[in-house]
Amino acid sequence: LEVQVPEDPVVALVGTDATLCCSFSPEPGFSLAQLNLIWQLTDTKQLVHSFAEGQDQGSAYANRTALFPDLLAQGNASLRLQRVRVADEGSFTCFVSIRDFGSAAVSLQVAAPYSKPSMTLEPNKDLRPGDTVTITCSSYQGYPEAEVFWQDGQGVPLTGNVTTSQMANEQGLFDVHSILRVVLGANGTYSCLVRNPVLQQDAHSSVTITPQRSPTGAVEVQVPEDPVVALVGTDATLRCSFSPEPGFSLAQLNLIWQLTDTKQLVHSFTEGRDQGSAYANRTALFPDLLAQGNASLRLQRVRVADEGSFTCFVSIRDFGSAAVSLQVAAPYSKPSMTLEPNKDLRPGDTVTITCSSYRGYPEAEVFWQDGQGVPLTGNVTTSQMANEQGLFDVHSVLRVVLGANGTYSCLVRNPVLQQDAHGSVTITGQPMTFPPEA
């Protein structure tokens, strides 16, 4: 019996589902009652899944496998493996028996992408050519082990003093930390590239070292004094300008935008050309305005993670730089109010009122007050939790003894937007239910 499987390994991302294809050619008159199908681990022979006596015998492998029952009669013996883990990697054998039998093995290759590397520089202040610095590149939770490459701004490999360590967690995912010790040139870019050899995925970051002190006659670079406030998901313009001298041409301009604290490269314009975004492909210059001295940076689809200081570095013959702060904000939702207990309430009862407001940034200030606007500061517990995007949910709980009647208001303030979102509950004198029934 000829059993067919793919020659190439099946590549599956951690956490996703994978299909291990396997097929046979059923003869005319074939019925499932004749079929014995066994999936097993090739090396240990551990049973994974089976079909026998006309019935799916189910998963013997952590309840994460399934056949395609509607397709079996057509010769499709493929196996679905759910929520793939690193531990699943290896060879699976598909064994098919009708009158004759046959088998074939298919390889599962598991992979997980590495995170965008973080770059740190030590020391990171008052750097001068000739100083020795340590640059650390860290990337997280990938599989299999990464290949790490360092290069300078011209793409020349830096193979000198590099130490790379990789650590695996209980799930088998690796963190990689690579440390480069280098003597600074006059100025330069140092890039770290973390490659996933299976996915052929490259995650990279760069730091750019710019001169710290300028001679007299420095280029005057102007940025706004106040932080630029941008709502999550919108675009922001970080304004930066310089005064070009008569006869200035873009061929003379070196413009570098970088993160102020880590020196990570964000965007650059050199040798008369826009060198593009080094920051998640979400940045752009204003090319038509550069010749007039407008070096502003457009940052698209702002995220909480973008918050911080960005330095605009302009070099023509002399150079100058200035930093502009980006303050990210997101409005809080209208609070939802819940009351416990919420039935047959009477004056003198102790109730718990919960005020919940969602997906704001930065952390909120929460105020409780009664119907007369008098603050209620007594028994209040407020907790804030950030999600993966950095947006906060706020839950504030007030425990209060009911008066004859009264209103209890919760105000959630966004300190950056000066936006107030409020909700309230009103308790009447009669026994009542909350929310009031229609």
Partner: nanobody
Framework: EVQLVESGGGEVQPGGSLRLSCAAS????????MSWFRQAPGKQREPVAT???????NYAESVKGRFTISRDNAKNTVYLQMNSLRAEDTAVYYC???????????WGQGTLVTVKP
């Protein structure tokens, strides 16, 4: 900018225990991968343990089963519980914070751990 302040270092005998703390400024602590590195005299800095923002942890082979990293997001603090200390654990221990999404990274100033009889 995130500021990191380590504490809890000191001198201890072989087999003893220490607990290091690293307090971070800033309101998005839960977004950071928090790591402990160490640097022994004359050696390169090396990673010891990491607490990911998603809750999983990684350890260097040399400390597995002896060191435990944990974090308290409410207190913006990461800890390193070090048990069964050995002479070769003597080093300056540094705290590192790496943002899980934007590539920003920060170091603390370090705290010295000395293991000697």
């Amino acid at each position: 900018e995130v500021q990191l302040v380590e504490s809890g270092g000191g001198e201890v005998q072989p087999g003893g225990s220490l607990r290091l703390s690293c307090a971070a400024s800033g309101s998005t602590f839960s977004m950071y991968h928090m790591s402990w590195f160490r640097q022994a005299p004359g050696k390169q800095r090396e990673p010891v343990a990491t607490s990911h923002h998603g809750g999983t942890t990684n350890y260097a082979e040399s400390v597995k089963g002896r060191f435990t990293i944990s974090r308290d997001n409410a207190k913006n603090t990461v800890y390193l519980q070090m048990n069964s200390l050995r002479a070769e654990d003597t080093a300056v221990y540094y705290c590192k914070a790496d943002h899980g999404y934007n590539g920003r990274g920060y170091w603390g100033q370090g705290t010295l751990v000395t293991v000697k009889p």
